[in-house]
C-alpha cells in the first residue's frame, strides 16, 4: 500500500504519500478551530507510470498509452485512496463544541 | 457533473472530461482484441481550484492550502469518477469469447 | 507545535567544508522524511535533498550531487547536511523542513543557517 509506512520511509518518485502538516491558521485563514492548532493531513504526489498502483482498468489503459505516447499528457495522476476523519473543537458563543470533520487525513494513495 | 454534455460543449480550462479515442493496436500495442478495433475512453484534465468540484473535505482542504500558498505545489488533482464498461470480441483460438471489460470508459470527472 | 532550528553556518572559503544541523521538536521526528531548502539571495526557495524517515533512501538536487550528504539521527531528532567542495553558489539560508520538499515547498518553519562561500 502507497501508506505512511512505505512512503515516508522511501520517500519514492512515483506516486506516494507526502507529508503535509497544515496550520489552520496560517495555511487556510481559519480561526474558529479552538483545537488542534494544525493536523497531518498528507497528501498525494508523484508520477504513475505504467501498473505503479493502478485503481482501475482505465488508468492502467491511459499509463500504457502514455508510455506509447510520452507527448499526449493523457496519464492517470496520484491521488487519495484511504481518507480519515479528524476531530476538533470549536465555540459557538462560548459553547464548546467538538466535530469530526470526515475525509480530513489522507492515509494511502493510488494512481487513477 | 463534470461530464460529456457540460464539458465537451465548455472547452474548460479547469477540471473537466476530455475526448481521447484510443486505438487498441496504435496505442496499447494490443492486438488480442478483435472488435471494437478501438473505443472513446476520454480522460481527466484540467486545474482544480478552490471549490472546483472538490470531492472530498481534504480536496476542499488542500485547494485551499493551494490558495493561500501558490509555491508550494501541493493540490488536488483532476481524476475519473464515473466509469463505465467495454464490451469487446476477442478469439481464443477460433472460438469467439465476448467480454465486458470493466471501468474501461470515463464518464465524469471530479477534484480528489 | 512543530519546531525547526537550524544551525551551523558561516563564512567559509571556496571549496571548503560545512556541516549543518536541525534540531526538531513537537512531533515525531522518527515517522518523517526531512529535507533541506535554500534560498540564495533574491531567489525563490530550491529543494537541496531529502532523507526517508529510517535514513536509508536519500535524493539530491543535480546542483549538490556528489558534495552534498544528507544524513539523520533519529535517537537526538536531529537532521544533518555535510556540505563539502562548497562554490559561490552555494551561498544561501539553509532550512530543513518536515516531509519530501520536491512536492511541497512548505513555509520555513525556522529561522535558517547562513552560508557564504567567499574567498
Known amino acids: 500500500a502507497l501508506d505512511a509506512a512505505y512512503c515516508f520511509r522511501n520517500v519514492q518518485d512515483n506516486c506516494c504519500l507526502r507529508p503535509l502538516y497544515i496550520d489552520f491558521k496560517r495555511d487556510l485563514g481559519w480561526k474558529w478551530i479552538h483545537e488542534p492548532k494544525g493536523y497531518n493531513a498528507n497528501f498525494c504526489a508523484g508520477a504513475c507510470p505504467y501498473l505503479w498502483s493502478s485503481d482501475t482498468q482505465h488508468s492502467r489503459v491511459l499509463s500504457l498509452y502514455n508510455t506509447i505516447n510520452p507527448e499526449a499528457s493523457a496519464s492517470p495522476c496520484c491521488v487519495s485512496q484511504d481518507l480519515e476523519p479528524l476531530t476538533i473543537l470549536y465555540y459557538i458563543g462560548k459553547t464548546p463544541k467538538i466535530e469530526q470533520l470526515s475525509n480530513m487525513i489522507v492515509k494511502s494513495c493510488k494512481c487513477s | 457533473a463534470l461530464d460529456a454534455a457540460y464539458c465537451f460543449r465548455n472547452v474548460q480550462d479547469n477540471c473537466c472530461l476530455r475526448p481521447l479515442y484510443i486505438d487498441f493496436k496504435r496505442d496499447l500495442g494490443w492486438k488480442w482484441i478483435h472488435e471494437p478495433k478501438g473505443y472513446n475512453a476520454n480522460f481527466c484534465a484540467g486545474a482544480c481550484p478552490y471549490l472546483w468540484s472538490s470531492d472530498t473535505q481534504h480536496s476542499r482542504v488542500l485547494s485551499l492550502y493551494n490558495t493561500i500558498n501558490p509555491e508550494a505545489s501541493a493540490s488536488p488533482c483532476c481524476v475519473s469518477q464515473d466509469l463505465e464498461p467495454l464490451t469487446i470480441l476477442y478469439y481464443i483460438g477460433k472460438t469467439p469469447k465476448i467480454e465486458q471489460l470493466s471501468n474501461m470508459i470515463v464518464k465524469s470527472c471530479k477534484c480528489s | 507545535q512543530l519546531q525547526l532550528v537550524e544551525s551551523g553556518g558561516g563564512l567559509v572559503q571556496p571549496g571548503g567544508s560545512l556541516t549543518l544541523s536541525c534540531l526538531a521538536s513537537?512531533?515525531?521526528?522518527?515517522?518523517?522524511?526531512m529535507s533541506w531548502v535554500r534560498q540564495a539571495p533574491g531567489k525563490g526557495l530550491e529543494w537541496v535533498s531529502v532523507i526517508g524517515s529510517d535514513g536509508a533512501i536519500k535524493h539530491y538536487s543535480d546542483s549538490v550531487k556528489g558534495r552534498f550528504a544528507i544524513s539523520r539521527d533519529n535517537a537526538k531528532n536531529t537532521l544533518y547536511l555535510q556540505m563539502n567542495s562548497l562554490k559561490p553558489e552555494d551561498t544561501a539560508v539553509y532550512y530543513c523542513?518536515?516531509?519530501?520538499?520536491?512536492?511541497?515547498?512548505?513555509?520555513?518553519r525556522g529561522q535558517g543557517t547562513q552560508v557564504t562561500v567567499s574567498s
Open positions: 513537537g512531533f515525531t521526528f522518527s515517522h518523517y522524511p
Open positions: 523542513a518536515e516531509g519530501d520538499s520536491r512536492y511541497v515547498r512548505n513555509r520555513a
